[in-house]
């Protein structure tokens, strides 16, 4: 008799994939053309993504340091108006991508909950909600709650609203900590609330520091559901040393939580990078054209378009790394293990019942090494083959799909492998 | 047998270039790294630079700017090159293999002996 | 970079005789990646003792490496005249790589 089937867990749409943060509609669309209509126009390229929900704003009403300017149930005529927001809710969920409102009071400020004015602004924030939740969204973010006083009361009766809505709809909390024990009693309170951090970011980025931020992170957290990313708002490129970029992508996308992403960091966008560029809000590279004040100053393997037609590219890598996490059951919800392996290296396991496993090593160093992967550290439920079959290599040169032995297995500087073998009974 | 073998031009004259092939046999540039280290007479070993199996190479930021390592995979060889050559370049100049065990140098070449001099 | 001091820069020993020689850091070095080389007069160097206390293929077991953070050594229980030769270590830690000066031994 085959052995019984491990039951599924339950899945809320945010399990099954990654999101992306667009914090600045008018950089994400390039120049002088930032509204909700054009970006109903670039959901065929959010799709192709493979993203599962996009975190959006603030588009409210704002004006600078000012409670009484700000105006939460209204959209600044900037981004456009509400029927846009309705049309652009109508089309991403024809498309299957989630909404997500950001709902950062002081976006515009210097202190982005009115530190003076918090009860205020928590009452509209409350209202806000109601309002936004009957209009379709499918969640809500607030960033920065390290300034906003009690905010895990805040939160829970927050996250109340947005649950006792629907269990579908999903509370996002933002903080530039990136201490292990403020993002726990953050977490404490709300039992459904994603959190984003610069928790991976405060790292000397080797593979035994980020196995042993990861490790303690998953345990601290105990069986809750995680979100990965490096900061609650900002770009990959302005946290990681550019050889680190590919690794990180093929990390974020395998440990088990949501991966959450800035809009760029799927090309390797850099926070000014061209002249005259904000800091906080760089243009998207859409192509050639999309910086015109300086000819030349954008070349093609910088943007989307180019990178599109590139299958090394870091954006091909993204793509398919995205795929393979919204389909595969072992990476949707599966079990993790890591295992020791040579120095500067972290390797895990995510594996779930009968399903096809995936292996993932990644080489933080900028030294060639063998994987010296030790199995012995694995529960029986996850050992390792002899051989296992590459996905990819974050790294041009070697042959998807090739089987490769796993005792003579041996990494690039800054490699990342990930290899799928088949459960055995 | 795995074996590493030196050629270089052993005269070079100052402010002129270098150019070393490393001609590797027994194993494949694919999978190792190769280094590169001189020494000059009487003198300690200096490291140069490696070039990985996959191409990355990285060089000692004290010659970077004079130095260059390729390969060609299929004749399995690693080709050092340095320019503006001065009299304490002189040295015997080694290539060694990179097994990926831990940034060691598992096997060395004879050395092909380089003097500076007009 | 990380510098590595070798001590004694010399030395001469009695066969049978005991000998120690140390390498020295100016910062941190992982055991996985300080190694120990032989080279004889007028030859190439040879891989001796890897990630501390490995030693290479055919060397003889008389040999053994220690240490870890700064602090890193090489020891022959009982000396041959066949050991007459300098011994260099090396480290990784970040490039560049750095070798030692080396400690000759010389055999009375």
């Known amino acids: 008799r085959a052995p019984r089937c491990r039951e599924l867990p339950a899945q809320k749409w945010w399990h099954t994939g990654a999101l992306y943060r667009i914090g600045d509609l008018q950089a994400f669309q390039g120049h002088g053309s930032g509204n909700l209509a054009g970006l109903k126009g670039r959901l065929d390229y959010l799709s192709s993504l493979k993203v599962k929900g996009l975190v959006l704003g603030p588009l409210h009403k704002n004006q600078k340091d000012d409670v009484a300017q700000t105006d939460l149930l209204q959209i600044d005529p900037n981004f456009g108006s509400k029927e846009d927001f309705d049309n652009l809710l109508q089309s991403a969920k024809k498309k299957s991508i989630r909404v997500i409102l950001d709902l950062t009071p002081n976006y515009r400020g210097e202190n982005l909950w009115f530190s003076t004015q918090v009860d205020s602004v928590a009452t509209k924030v409350k209202d806000a909600l109601e309002f936004w939740l009957q209009a379709g969204v499918d969640g809500f973010q607030v960033r920065d709650i390290e300034n906003l006083k009690d905010a895990s009361s805040f939160l829970a009766e927050w996250e109340n609203i947005t649950k006792g809505f629907s269990e579908d709809r999903l509370l996002i909390a933002g903080t530039n900590s990136s201490d292990l024990q403020q993002i726990v009693s953050l977490l404490e309170s709300n039992k459904d609330l994603l959190l984003t951090s610069s928790y991976l970011s405060d790292s000397s980025f080797t593979g035994e520091h980020t196995k042993s931020l990861v490790t303690q992170y998953l345990n601290a957290t105990g069986n809750r559901w995680c979100s990965w990313s490096l900061s609650q708002a900002g770009l990959l490129t302005s946290f990681l040393p550019a050889q680190l970029l590919r690794l990180y992508q093929l990390m974020l996308f395998t440990l088990p939580g949501t991966p959450v992403f800035s809009y760029g960091d799927e090309i390797g966008l850099k926070a000014a990078a061209l002249p005259g560029q904000p800091v906080e809000a760089p243009v998207m590279l859409w192509d050639e054209s999309s910086f015109p004040d300086i000819p030349g100053a954008v070349s093609a393997n910088m943007t989307v378009k180019g990178q599109s037609e590139d299958p090394g590219s870091l954006l091909s890598l993204f793509r398919q790394l995205s795929d393979q996490r919204s389909k595969e059951r072992s990476l949707l919800h599966g079990d993790f293990h890591t295992f020791s392996s040579g120095p500067g290296l972290f390797s895990y396991i995510r594996h779930w019942d009968q399903n096809e496993r995936f292996l993932v090593v990644l080489n933080f160093g900028d030294v060639g090494l063998s994987a010296g992967l030790q199995a012995s550290d694995l529960p029986a439920s996850a050992s390792l083959p002899t051989k296992a079959d590459l996905v990819l290599s974050t790294q041009p040169g070697r042959e998807e799909g090739s089987p490769l032995e796993l005792e003579r297995l041996k990494l690039e500087p800054h490699e990342g492998l990930l290899l799928r073998f088949p459960y055995v009974a | 047998q795995v074996q590493l073998k030196e050629s270089g031009p052993g005269l070079v004259a100052p402010s002129q270039s270098l150019s070393i092939t490393c001609t590797v046999s027994?194993?494949?540039?694919?999978?190792?790294?190769v280094h590169w280290v001189r020494q000059p007479p009487g003198k300690g070993l200096e490291w140069l630079g490696v070039?990985?199996?996959?191409?990355?190479?990285y060089y000692n930021s004290a010659l970077m700017s004079r130095l260059s390592i390729s390969k060609d995979n299929a004749k399995s060889q690693v080709l050092l090159k340095m320019s503006s050559l001065q009299t304490d370049d002189t040295a015997m100049y080694y290539c060694a293999r990179d097994n990926y065990g831990g940034v060691y140098l598992d096997v060395w070449g004879a050395g092909t002996t380089v003097t500076v001099s007009s | 970079e990380n510098v590595l001091t070798q001590s004694p820069a010399s030395m001469s020993a009695s066969p049978g005789e005991k000998v120690t020689m140390t390498c020295r850091a100016s910062s941190s070095v992982s055991s996985s990646y300080l190694h120990w080389y032989q080279q004889k007069s007028g030859a190439s160097p040879k891989l001796w003792i890897y990630s501390t206390s490995n030693l290479a293929s055919g060397v003889p077991a008389r040999f053994s490496g220690s240490g870890s953070g700064t602090s890193y050594s090489l020891t022959i229980s009982s000396v041959e005249a066949e050991d007459a030769a300098t011994y260099y270590c090396?480290?990784?830690?970040?490039?560049?790589?750095?070798f030692g000066s080396g400690t000759k031994l010389e055999i009375k």
């Open positions: 027994g194993f494949s540039l694919t999978s190792y790294g």
């Open positions: 070039i990985w199996a996959g191409g990355s190479t």
């Open positions: 090396q480290q990784y830690s970040g490039y560049p790589l750095t």
